[in-house]
Amino acid sequence: EVEKTACPSGKKAREIDESLIFYKKWELEACVDAALLATQMDRVNAIPFTYEQLDVLKHKLDELYPQGYPESVIQHLGYLFLKMSPEDIRKWNVTSLETLKALLEVNKGHEMSPQVATLIDRFVKGRGQLDKDTLDTLTAFYPGYLCSLSPEELSSVPPSSIWAVRPQDLDTCDPRQLDVLYPKARLAFQNMNGSEYFVKIQSFLGGAPTEDLKALSQQNVSMDLATFMKLRTDAVLPLTVAEVQKLLGPHVEGLKAEERHRPVRDWILRQRQDDLDTLGLGLQGGIPNGYLVLDLSMQEALS
């Protein structure tokens, strides 16, 4: 807390300018009017205030706006934003995408801080849903943003926003998140033709059900092994050897290198060895010839 002291004669700030960086902490507190600071916030970022001086400026704004800063001030916070606590930010009402962009720019190149996470949460809740422009902005600054949301939060993403998603934005998503995003992507890209559709839907396929994988296998898509390895195990297991061969195309040879890893390992265990042998890859572990395969799941469904 800065002590209240009278401003020395002739030092009262008439505007926010570079001369203030030579003021000591107590002089800044005594000689800079909070209302003047608020109206000239756009100048603060251009002035190299020290880490310690920024504390004083924040303190002045906190006194002026105890219920939270107005958006006109928030938009121009610049590096002062990094001095804010999540508690400070929860008092704000940020509605403008320009304000959000300005504050994200300050944190650019750094990991998502608790301040940024709180800011985004306030902004998205204020908008009611994660619209395309917002998602565009957030993933541009934080490629992993989508995957930081819970499946419940992702359910508020409209299918139209999926067009803003790039493959790298989904790198850290887990299957539960892809389960939510895949149907939205399928809806968003439904009017595209085969090859274009596959390029767009590919990064979402970790949430695809068996029937969609079967459909893709009929379209000569040549799925790469990296994508195949991210598919849901339960979606891959019912696929026949012929379907997997069609799905992977020339990439089918890569199965050999992955035969000990899921989902390939589990899929092999479900296939007849005879069928696996037709691939000519030397895959082992299938059901031996002459064995009867009982589909227990079907049996349970009937009983």
Partner: antibody, heavy 120, light 106 residues
Framework: DVQLQESGPGLVKPSQSLSLTCSVT?????????WNWIRQFPGNKLEWMGF???????NYNPSLKNRISITRDTSKNQFFLKLNSVTTEDTATYYC?????????????WGQGTLVTVSA | QIVLTQSPAIMSASPGEKVTMTCSAS?????MYWYQQKPGSSPRLLIY???NLASGVPVRFSGSGSGTSYSLTISRMEAEDAATYYC?????????FGGGTKLEIK
Amino acid sequence: DVQLQESGPGLVKPSQSLSLTCSVTGDSITSGYYWNWIRQFPGNKLEWMGFIRFDGTNNYNPSLKNRISITRDTSKNQFFLKLNSVTTEDTATYYCAREGSYAPAWFAYWGQGTLVTVSA
Amino acid sequence: QIVLTQSPAIMSASPGEKVTMTCSASSSLSYMYWYQQKPGSSPRLLIYDTSNLASGVPVRFSGSGSGTSYSLTISRMEAEDAATYYCQQWSSYPPTFGGGTKLEIK
């Protein structure tokens, strides 16, 4: 990791200009930091000389009056010190250093330093 | 400008001994920074924001203080800690350094 390397002549004549270069690797001088020059006199006293900010703006120690200029070449990721009208009092080890925060506070990264002797 | 006065100017300690050095400021500060410098090397940041340890600094180093009085403590002196230690402020311009405390090993 961020690395800074000073270079320049080790001997300068009185009344001439001292010019030094700081080459930076591992970070861009246009990223959100402050790039400083600091010197250490023979008695070990340290003095901050000035900085060039990520946006190209400067600030200098008032004690150096109008003798100092810090500039940069973003294409080479280098920044420069020029000190005019040197005297023997300017004999020192000169360091370039990068700020450790988003606002001026502490010096997190230092070059290894270069000794400059001012002598006739 | 803010003047920083370090004391003592020179001190010595035995291995395992606790060492404390101080830095006094001519005006009240919120943060103090500490550096270690060994002969022939550049200063190395030890402590930032008064008490936070910089990356790679052993936990035997600690910083404390407020207002105009700050200190650096080494809980158990080791031979490699023999060096000169500087405090630094950047509360307002220009930033300034203390004159240093030279720590020798007994």
